[in-house]
């Protein structure tokens, strides 16, 4: 029977700059029941606070609701593991919410084949930003990426859409069924997961010629 091994805070993520969650990996338990607590202070603060919510984020997590999420403020946090034989502490982790945003995937992905009489046909892709993100405040700039491939192909074709929420693709293989997905990322932060795939059948008469 031993004191617990050193825990590690390995990830912090925010869906929208309004809340965030951090997760830790326990060290070895020393063969004894082990309690974990996360304590933190904000940069410039002389007080320590305990994690406000150990439940919402699941096991080995600490969730900071909107009451406890400050922009432009660094949080300095550590996890303490304690059993009957002693304690061990993780390294301190410095967290700035601005840089840990990972949005939900974009919504309402719509894909349509457009065949104007006077111009080349194209694939028209449209989507909406994730609901948790408030773009009106100007706090957020979301960038988008689209990927698509024929159903049986191994390789994805990737297109960067910038800030726009619609995109045209001209070069497609006629008669193929395509999978299309979109994801987003804030100006600082992480790419979201890809949205659920939308399928589109490209007509056989879809021409790539002028």
């Amino acid at each position: 029977q031993l004191p617990p091994g050193k825990p590690e805070i390995f990830k912090c993520r925010s869906p929208n700059k309004e809340t965030f969650t951090c997760w830790w990996r326990p060290g070895t338990d020393g063969g004894l029941p082990t309690n974990y607590s996360l304590t933190y202070h904000r940069e410039g603060e002389t007080l320590m606070h305990e994690c406000p919510d150990y439940i919402t984020g699941g096991p080995n997590s600490c969730h900071f609701g909107k009451q406890y999420t400050s922009m432009w403020r660094t949080y300095i946090m550590m996890v303490n593991a304690t059993n009957q034989m002693g304690s061990s502490f993780s390294d301190e982790l410095y967290v700035d919410v601005t840089y840990i945003v990972q949005p939900d995937p974009p919504l309402e992905l719509a894909v349509e084949v457009k065949q104007p009489e006077d111009r080349k046909p194209y694939l028209w892709i449209k989507w909406s930003p994730p609901t948790l993100i408030d773009l009106k405040t100007g706090w957020f700039t979301l960038l988008y990426e689209i990927r698509l491939k024929p159903e049986k192909a191994a390789e994805w074709e990737i297109h960067f859409a910038g800030q726009q929420t619609e995109f045209k693709i001209l070069s497609l293989h006629p008669g193929q069924k395509y999978l299309v997905q979109v994801r987003c990322k804030p100006d600082h932060g992480y790419w979201s997961a890809w949205s659920p795939a939308t399928f589109i059948q490209i007509p056989s008469d879809f021409t790539m010629n002028d």
């Epitope: 904000r42 603060e45 606070h49 919510d53 909107k66 009451q67």
Partner: antibody, heavy 121, light 107 residues
């Protein structure tokens, strides 16, 4: 309208006890850290006690530590201060005060009108 | 405990004049954690400034805050009748503490 209303003040002998209550309305009580601040007659402001919205660790000024106990009931939008072993120097107007955020140690943006506590023999 | 000292203790000025109030801390305070309040006679304190320089909701722009480290100030560009009151600074980097107050009275 956002407001806090205190009650429970009164006159008590040294060594006696009182329980102050505060009820909040017009805002989501459990989104904010809450505090008690007092002001002696003709004196300045003194922070007494506070804690974060989730009722985590309680915090006290040295002058009241071990004698006063803060508690809250978010379901009833209520904050309490149990005051034991009262002394003459605890005589003051006691304000219930809201922190701007979930932390008690924040700027205090809503103040109740106060309830007067007088400790006298 | 972080001790705050305010100066002057009393400031005698006329309506329309500019007032500068000082608050000094016994140790360095991060500017995110300093606030100013006004307390009119017989009334509860009102938050004016938080985070050293951010005006609270509904506070007119004649109030401005500045400073860093251990020295902070509140400036009232033109005194209105309701500004003849006591002003307190407060730090909340640690357990909250208030300064002793500066009284602004009519000259």
């Amino acid at each position: 309208e956002v407001q806090l209303v205190e009650s429970g003040g009164g006159v008590v002998r040294p060594g006696g006890s009182l329980r102050l209550s505060c009820v909040g309305s017009g805002f989501s009580f459990d989104d904010h850290g809450m505090n008690w601040v007092r002001q002696g007659p003709g004196k300045g402001l003194e922070w007494v006690s506070g804690f974060n919205w989730n009722g985590g660790s309680t915090n006290y000024a040295e002058s009241v530590k071990g004698r006063f106990t803060i508690s809250r009931d978010n379901a009833r939008n209520s904050l309490f201060l149990q005051m034991n072993s009262l002394r003459a120097e605890d005589t003051a107007l006691y304000y219930c005060v809201r922190g701007r955020s979930g932390w008690f140690n924040d700027a205090f943006d809503v103040w109740g009108p106060g309830t007067m506590v007088t400790v006298s023999s | 405990e972080i001790v705050l000292t305010q100066s002057p203790g009393t400031l005698s000025l006329s309506p329309g004049e500019r007032a500068t109030l000082s608050c000094r801390a016994s140790q360095t305070i991060n500017s995110n954690y300093l606030a100013w309040y006004r307390q009119k006679p017989g009334q509860t304190p009102r938050l004016l400034i938080y985070g050293t320089s951010s005006r609270a909701t509904g506070i007119p722009d004649r109030f401005s805050g500045s400073g860093s480290g251990t020295d902070f100030s509140l400036t009232i560009s033109r005194l209105e009748p309701e500004d003849f009151a006591v002003f307190y600074c407060q730090q909340y980097a640690g357990l909250p503490t208030f300064g002793p107050g500066t009284k602004v009275d009519i000259k």
